[in-house]
Interface confidence: low
């Protein structure tokens, strides 16, 4: 399996909410001995290996934001810690998983990484990640809503997020 990032860039005004999304692609083993660990973190724009460095999102580490479940099951972080920081990560049974950030500030600008680890009990683990940029803007040139830019060839380069 691999991880796809539908959008590589999110440009949002201050104060807006945004949902960053990753999608699990390919065959997913739904056996009872397989679980998926999904999480989010910030990273730096290292030119050799993207997402190699794990920085917290609004002081929450990737451990704080993780989802742990089997196959394409739905899950979400509803614990108070994340919500107190205006964050919520979620996953659906179609392989999509996301992190929602509320009331964006300029400090939220940066590179965000989603991480999926397939854990096969007593055997091995397979990990893949995806990266996307969030740019929070202020002032006269800031968009009125979030604008998202596809990662690869699609009909529209910029789609205004609802």
């Amino acid at each position: 399996f691999k991880v796809a990032t539908p959008y590589s860039l999110y440009v949002c005004p201050e104060g807006q909410n945004v949902t960053l999304t990753c999608r699990l692609l390919g065959p997913v083993d739904k056996g009872h001995d397989v679980t998926f660990y999904k999480t989010w973190y910030r990273s730096s724009r290292g030119e050799v290996q993207t997402c190699s460095e794990r920085r917290p999102i609004r002081n929450l580490t990737f451990q704080d934001l993780h989802l742990h479940h089997g196959g394409h099951q739905a899950a979400n972080t509803s614990h108070d810690l994340a919500q107190r920081h205006g964050l919520e990560s979620a996953s659906d049974h179609h392989g999509n998983f996301s992190i929602t950030m509320r009331n964006l500030t300029l400090l939220d600008s940066g590179l965000y990484c989603c991480l999926v680890v397939e854990i096969r009990h007593h055997h091995s683990e397979h990990r893949v990640h995806g990266a996307m940029e969030l740019q929070v803007q202020t002032g006269k040139d800031a968009p009125s809503n979030c604008v998202v830019y596809p990662s690869s060839s699609q009909d529209s380069e910029n789609i205004t997020a609802a």
Partner: antibody
Framework: QSLEESGGRLVTPGTPLTLTCTVS????????MAWVRQAPGEGLEWIGT??????TYYPTWVKGRFTISKPSSTTVDLRMTSPTTEDTATYFC??????????????WGPGTLVTVSS | DIVMTQTPSSVSAAVGGTVTINCQAS??????LAWYQQKPGQPPKLLIY???DLASGVPSRFSGSGSGKQFTLTISGVQCDDAATYYC??????????????FGGGTEMVVK
């Protein structure tokens, strides 16, 4: 990963010219590519960027004088529609960190020289 | 259009000394700024990105700082090999479709 520009030569003013950047080991569906030029003894001047999805961005001064395209999975073209003597420069192609416009140029080609003269 | 103004246009440095090069954006670009080094007959080489992050393989004597509109490249313990022209680059993405030239005018450094 490498980039190499080609197509630079002596042309007369008004004669269209296409420069080609040939990439090796680079997935053009994942990275933005840019063209940057440098007139003799002058600084760097950004001409434009083509995103991973094929969308193009140009500075305001370009005004249709240049067109960037991706004709294949390994080439990025810069078309000079009607060159003037002021377009005499070394033309570089560069690979961005990521797929969209706002990016750092981590990898550059050696450049190709275009001379526009009558 | 965002305009990038680089100062000084030239600087002379002694081996072992320290040099600072400044770059000013006409409006805030947060930390979306890179620095490049270019030697005659060669393409530019990335030194610093995100205003202060060192690109791989770049010696630690190069450092970057700043945010918003004001940025600085500092070269400590200057070496002969550092003689080159240095450029700043703005890569702030604006949803306003007007883009200026993203590079500063360059600073030529001579090492004595």
């Amino acid at each position: 990963q490498s980039l190499e520009e080609s197509g630079g030569r002596l042309v007369t003013p008004g004669t269209p010219l296409t420069l080609t950047c040939t990439v090796s080991g680079i997935d053009l569906s994942s990275y933005a590519m840019a063209w940057v030029r440098q007139a003799p003894g002058e600084g760097l001047e950004w001409i434009g960027t083509i995103s991973s999805s094929g969308h193009t961005y140009y500075p305001t001064w370009v005004k249709g004088r240049f067109t960037i395209s991706k004709p294949s999975s390994t080439t990025v073209d810069l078309r000079m529609t009607s060159p003037t003597t002021e377009d005499t420069a070394t033309y570089f192609c560069a690979r961005g960190h990521y797929g969209y416009f706002g990016t750092v140029f981590a990898l550059w080609g050696p450049g190709t020289l275009v001379t526009v003269s009558s | 259009d965002i305009v990038m103004t680089q100062t000084p246009s030239s600087v002379s440095a002694a081996v072992g000394g320290t040099v600072t090069i400044n770059c000013q954006a006409s409006e805030s670009i947060q930390t979306y700024l890179a620095w490049y080094q270019q030697k005659p007959g060669q393409p530019p080489k990335l030194l610093i990105y995100d205003a202060s992050d060192l690109a791989s393989g770049v010696p630690s004597r190069f450092s970057g700082s700043g945010s918003g509109k004001q940025f600085t490249l500092t070269i400590s313990g200057v070496q002969c090999d550092d003689a080159a022209t240095y450029y700043c680059q703005n890569y702030y993405f604006s949803t306003n479709s007007n883009y200026g030239d993203v590079f500063g005018g360059g600073t030529e450094m001579v090492v004595k």
